[in-house]
């Protein structure tokens, strides 16, 4: 009886720690507002456990429900600089497979330099995530000012 | 066979359950920019589960991945008080041991009153963390408007 | 020996997986400052697992600490807008049972158009969670601008 | 194509007032800004001030009591006005494009220049 | 305001051969994880034009024979190898904070 309890306890690889945490690599060309994305120890502070890079965009390994969290900042900016090129916007959404395209969170920076926020989201095996920066406004690269992740929350 | 599997399981107590939220106990003398913590039941809904408090700021007892999340609010503040003085900025780091010393997540308030982030981001025992506030402005001791905390996410 | 330790492990209902992510159903009338939550997949990315809604607000039904979080942005905004308007207010609380009621979490938008923040906190079963818009203007229902959720985190 | 058009005059007495206008074409004054530098063979080149896409103007403080910016977004028009000049203000002055990115003050575009000899 | 000391004045390079021209500001012009240093070539009769921004990033339509490094206060731009057509004054300028500034030049003639 306790033998079969012990039975419906979790694995340790089904607990699917799946978690990433990326810095900013570059920005793509004029017409491209993703921004691309690297990660790794070799880098600093930033890694990959289960989510793999493809192309600077974050794809994902697991089935689940994810947090999905970003930090933002303009490069060399000040509230006069931001309110000067608005509108400056940052989405972050399922960018393919097309079939399941969709914008999952959305913030404009208005007259600030920084936008940070985070939600709950269900990601499948193979969505990639795209986070497009749309305005003119080129993005900090400071690790500590701009990062993007995910974290593997429960099936 | 079936109890061989159940050894792969994972034991409760290395689930590092290690998590802490903490309220402003007060800011530092005038040339210490950091902001000092506290946390306990006693306080109201801040707790200490694993990491520990060492004159104000945040220990680390468990290796792992954290999420960091902060939220700082200036006292009685509006945006015409944020943009006058200037630039004020939060930054929370590792500040010891030295060798690991490491900004992790940085916003400056320009035109606002209120910084809110989080990061993915290794923490190792023994790390400290410090939030440092630089500007002259006194941050909000409201235990809803200033807090921070850690929470342990995997190994 | 080996049997005993695997009865030390967690069995996977009392991980406490439970989550919720919920998007803007409506305002009040009036006098009633708060929002009114929707969730389900049948509305697109928002869920509940095991919290559940009672009359747009959520009802918490496990004891643990949550990790709590929010997005709100105004309809149709811009920083003449939200300065326009001032003083809007979103508070985060438990708003029953009477005797447990508190704010959790609080944040102007003073020139801003969206709020973002997250905290730790302990939260009971029965514990209903109130978001508080205080100010004339109308919050955003696009599901990546304005959310709310949360995550069970540990007991 | 990319093209800054620079009309003026080549003459101005001491103590009279610069009008320069630069025409653009092949993109919008509405995306990007557009600065004005100026050089000369005593100072080399000098940045003057710029015109955001929004309007609003940031001046060399050197240059912000006599220096006036303006522009006509529907005529593709920018306007420079410097008053009071003097005979080291002899330059060829030059209205120039911000580069794509709004926060990294560069100049791709530069118009043909406009040679000013200031002189009774 | 930040000033832009170059180096040399001028220098005189052998077809095919490398050119190097240094640039030292008076403070550091990085920020945001980027250098805010920018690189042009001016044609006598004509205006600047951008070769290089940020420090390192080739300006389209430039040929990959022009090349910037550089952080903080000491910036090089390099060409190689040097062709007929890049006799001109080269100059440098950052736009880390206003007013911007540039360099005084640097004159670079093809023996």
């Known amino acids: 009886q306790r033998f079969a309890q012990a039975q419906q306890q979790l694995p340790l690889e089904s607990l699917g720690w799946d978690v990433a945490e990326l810095q900013l690599n570059h920005t793509g060309p004029q017409q491209d507002p993703r921004l691309y994305w690297q990660g790794g120890p070799a880098l600093g502070r930033s890694f990959l456990h289960g989510p793999e890079l493809d192309k600077g965009q974050l794809r994902i390994h697991r089935d689940g429900i994810y947090m999905v969290h970003i930090q933002v900042t303009l490069a060399i900016c000040s509230s006069t600089t931001a309110s000067r090129h608005h509108p400056t916007t940052l989405a972050v959404g399922i960018c393919s497979p097309a079939s399941r395209s969709i914008s999952l969170l959305r913030l404009s920076f208005h007259q600030g330099c920084t936008i940070a926020s985070q939600r709950l989201t269900p990601l499948a095996r193979g969505d990639t995530l795209c986070t497009n920066l749309t305005g003119t406004l080129l993005p900090s690269r400071n690790t500590d000012e701009t990062f993007f992740g995910v974290q593997w929350v429960r099936p | 066979q079936r109890f061989a599997q159940a050894q792969q399981q994972l034991p409760l107590e290395s689930l590092g359950w290690d998590v802490a939220e903490l309220q402003l106990n007060h800011t530092g003398p005038q040339q210490d920019p950091r902001l000092y913590w506290q946390g306990g039941p006693a306080l109201g809904r801040s707790f200490l589960h694993g990491p520990e408090l060492d004159k104000g700021q945040l220990r680390i007892h468990r290796d792992g991945i954290y999420m960091v999340h902060i939220q700082v609010t200036l006292a009685i503040c509006s945006s015409t008080t944020a943009s006058r003085h200037h630039p004020t900025t939060l930054a929370v780091g590792i500040c010891s041991p030295a060798s690991r010393s490491i900004s992790l997540l940085r916003l400056s308030f320009h035109q606002g009153c209120t910084i809110a982030s989080q990061r993915l981001t290794p923490l190792a025992r023994g790390d400290t963390l410090c939030t440092n506030l630089t500007g002259t402005l006194l941050p909000s001791r409201n235990t809803d408007e200033t807090f921070f905390g850690v929470q342990w996410v995997r190994p | 020996q080996r049997f005993a330790q695997a009865q030390q492990q967690l069995p996977l209902e009392s991980l406490g997986w439970d989550v919720a992510e919920l998007q803007l159903n409506h305002t009040g009338p009036q006098q009633d400052p708060r929002l009114y939550w929707q969730g389900g997949p049948a509305l697109g990315r928002s869920f509940l697992h095991g919290p559940e809604l009672d009359k747009g607000q959520l009802r918490i039904h496990r004891d643990g600490i949550y990790m709590v979080h929010i997005q709100v942005t105004l309809a149709i905004c811009s920083s003449t807008t939200a300065s326009r308007h001032h003083p809007t207010t979103l508070a985060v609380g438990i708003c029953s049972p009477a005797s447990r009621s508190i704010s959790l979490l609080r944040l102007s938008f003073h020139q801003g158009c969206t709020i973002a923040s997250q905290r730790l906190t302990p939260l009971a079963r029965g514990d209903t969670l109130c978001t508080n818009l205080t100010g004339t203007l109308l919050p955003s229902r696009n599901t990546d601008e304005t959310f709310f959720g949360v995550q069970w985190v540990r007991p | 194509q990319v093209q800054l058009q620079q009309s003026g005059p080549g003459l101005v007495q001491p103590s009279q007032s610069l009008s320069i206008t630069c025409t653009v074409s092949?993109?919008?004054?509405?995306?990007?800004?557009v600065h004005w530098v100026r050089q000369s063979p005593g100072k080399g080149l000098e940045w003057l001030g710029v015109?955001?896409?929004?309007?609003?103007?940031d001046y060399n403080a050197a240059f912000i009591s006599r220096l006036s910016i303006s522009k006509d977004n529907s005529k593709s028009q920018v306007f420079f006005k410097m008053n009071s000049l003097q005979a080291d203000d002899t330059a060829i002055y030059y209205c120039?494009?911000?580069?794509?990115?709004?926060?990294?003050?560069?100049?791709?575009?530069w118009g043909q220049g406009t040679s000013v000899t200031v002189s009774s | 305001d930040i000033v832009l000391t170059q180096s040399p004045a001028s220098l005189a390079v052998s077809l095919g051969q490398r050119a190097t021209i240094s640039c030292r500001a008076s403070?550091?012009?990085?920020?945001?994880?980027?250098?805010?240093m920018h690189w042009y070539q001016q044609k006598a009769g004509q205006p600047p034009k951008l070769l290089i921004y940020?420090?390192?990033n080739l300006e389209s339509g430039v040929p990959a024979r022009f090349s910037g490094r550089g952080s903080g206060t000491d910036f090089t731009l390099n060409i190689h190898p040097v062709e007929e057509g890049d006799a001109a004054t080269y100059y440098c300028?950052?736009?880390?904070?206003?007013?911007?500034?540039f360099g005084a030049g640097t004159k670079l003639e093809i023996k």
């Open positions: 120039a494009r911000n580069i794509y990115y709004g926060n990294v003050y560069a100049m791709d575009y």
């Open positions: 092949g993109f919008s004054l509405t995306t990007y800004a």
């Open positions: 015109i955001w896409s929004v309007g609003s103007t």
């Open positions: 403070k550091s012009v990085d920020a945001s994880g980027y250098s805010f």
């Open positions: 940020l420090a390192s």
């Open positions: 300028q950052h736009s880390r904070e206003l007013p911007l500034t």
